[in-house]
């Protein structure tokens, strides 16, 4: 299996009740505007075939996509949560900048690409869905990267 390097986040990143709550509240606000409950971005299909030792690298890819293609373009929405949560997630992304996999990561990129394609296909409602799943993103980062 490919070896992942520097794919760790300090536990303290997830021990801040205020920003945790704001992340969940942002997800909640967006989720209330999401009427497509049949599609799940961060779920079984995303994790399929990816071992736990590779999972943090996978979530880094999802985090970066979410920031660049979803949160930054939608930064004027869902205030005041967005203005607090985006910098926090950007810091996590920065801390994972040296996280990489030595070896073939095609299976991971394939899963991430499916998530990206789903978001793009759904258009703005896909972006809303991605914001509505920020609690899942947060929890998956915590589960995989500590």
């Amino acid at each position: 299996a490919p070896i992942s390097s520097h794919c760790r986040l300090d536990k303290s990143n997830f021990q801040q009740p205020y920003i945790t709550n704001r992340t969940f509240m942002l997800a909640k606000e967006a989720s209330l505007a999401d009427n497509n409950t049949d599609v799940r971005l961060i779920g079984e299909k995303l994790f399929h075939g990816v071992s736990m030792s590779e999972r943090c690298y996978l979530m880094k890819q999802v985090l970066n996509f979410t920031l660049e293609e979803v949160l930054f373009p939608q930064s004027d929405r869902f205030q005041p949560y967005m203005q607090e949560v985006v910098p926090f997630l950007a810091r996590l992304s920065n801390r994972l900048s040296t996280c990489h996999i030595e070896g073939d990561d095609l299976h991971i990129q394939r899963n991430v690409q499916k998530l990206k394609d789903t978001v793009k296909k759904l258009g703005e409602s896909g972006e809303i869905k991605a914001i509505g799943e920020l609690d899942l993103l947060f929890m998956s980062l915590r589960n995989a990267c500590i």
């Epitope: 997830f14 509240m25 609690d135 899942l136």
Partner: antibody
Framework: EVQLVESGGGVVRPGGSLRLSCAAS????????MNWVRQAPGKGLEWVSG????????DYAASVKGRFTISRDNAKNSLYLQMNSLRAEDTALYHC??????????????WGRGTLVTVSS | QAALTQPASVSGSPGQSITISCTGA?????????VSWYQQHPGKAPKLIIY???KRPSGVSNRFSGSKSGNTASLTISGLQAEDEADYYC??????????FGGGTKLTVL
């Protein structure tokens, strides 16, 4: 076939300690978050504690925080719950539960039959 | 006290549909992204019947369906059958990294 077998329950006096074990088989143990869920006689379900795949995160219900410690040994495919300062209200059937899919430690897709803990003087 | 509120009991006749609601005691159980439902027959371990709000694990009858609206999640059982008589629990993961269950609903098939 996924199997979870709990052991270590018994009768203990208030203030006493017990260590529960859960032996897992039929799946790649370290690909899954694991949990302890309890059910007092005739009552509902109560989540007790959960641990992620590598033991890096350990979470507890407020009712047991500071008294119970969850741990896992991936080499032995085993989950543990160290229970200290036991109280009468800890009396329950304790189930070991596995996440439904890898990454979903918060959905309990597989359950053991449970081990009974009775705290009584 | 359970953090999620369910009716203590519901009943229905064979063939009917019933719905069990699950409401957060406060608004802070996220958006129910993590909601799941369990069925428990007397003397048995609980069984996961719905996860991700509305997904069914393989092997679970399509008579069981889940949904959410605002802070309330719901489980609907259609075409009620005698073997559906059991206790049903909703559950959600929360922003305090804990799992909360509802108090449980006893379903009686008349």
């Amino acid at each position: 076939e996924v199997q979870l077998v709990e052991s270590g329950g018994g009768v203990v006096r208030p203030g006493g300690s017990l260590r529960l074990s859960c032996a897992a088989s039929g799946f790649t143990f370290d690909d899954y978050g694991m949990n302890w869920v309890r059910q007092a006689p005739g009552k509902g379900l109560e989540w007790v504690s959960g641990v992620n795949w590598n033991g890096g995160t350990r979470d507890y219900a407020a009712s047991v925080k500071g008294r119970f410690t969850i741990s896992r040994d991936n080499a032995k495919n085993s989950l543990y719950l160290q229970m200290n300062s036991l109280r009468a209200e800890d009396t329950a059937l304790y189930h070991c539960a596995r996440g439904w899919y890898s990454g979903s430690f918060y959905y309990f897709g597989y359950w053991g039959r449970g081990t009974l803990v009775t705290v009584s003087s | 006290q359970a953090a999620l509120t369910q009716p203590a009991s519901v009943s229905g006749s064979p063939g009917q549909s019933i719905t069990i609601s699950c409401t957060g005691a406060s608004g802070d159980v996220g958006a129910y992204n993590f909601v799941s439902w369990y069925q428990q027959h007397p003397g048995k371990a609980p069984k996961l019947i719905i996860y991700d709000v509305n997904k069914r694990p393989s092997g679970v009858s399509n008579r069981f369906s889940g949904s959410k609206s605002g802070n309330t999640a719901s489980l609907t059982i259609s075409g009620l059958q005698a073997e559906d008589e059991a206790d049903y629990y909703c559950s959600s993961y929360t922003s305090t990294f804990s799992v909360v269950f509802g108090g449980g609903t006893k379903l009686t098939v008349l």
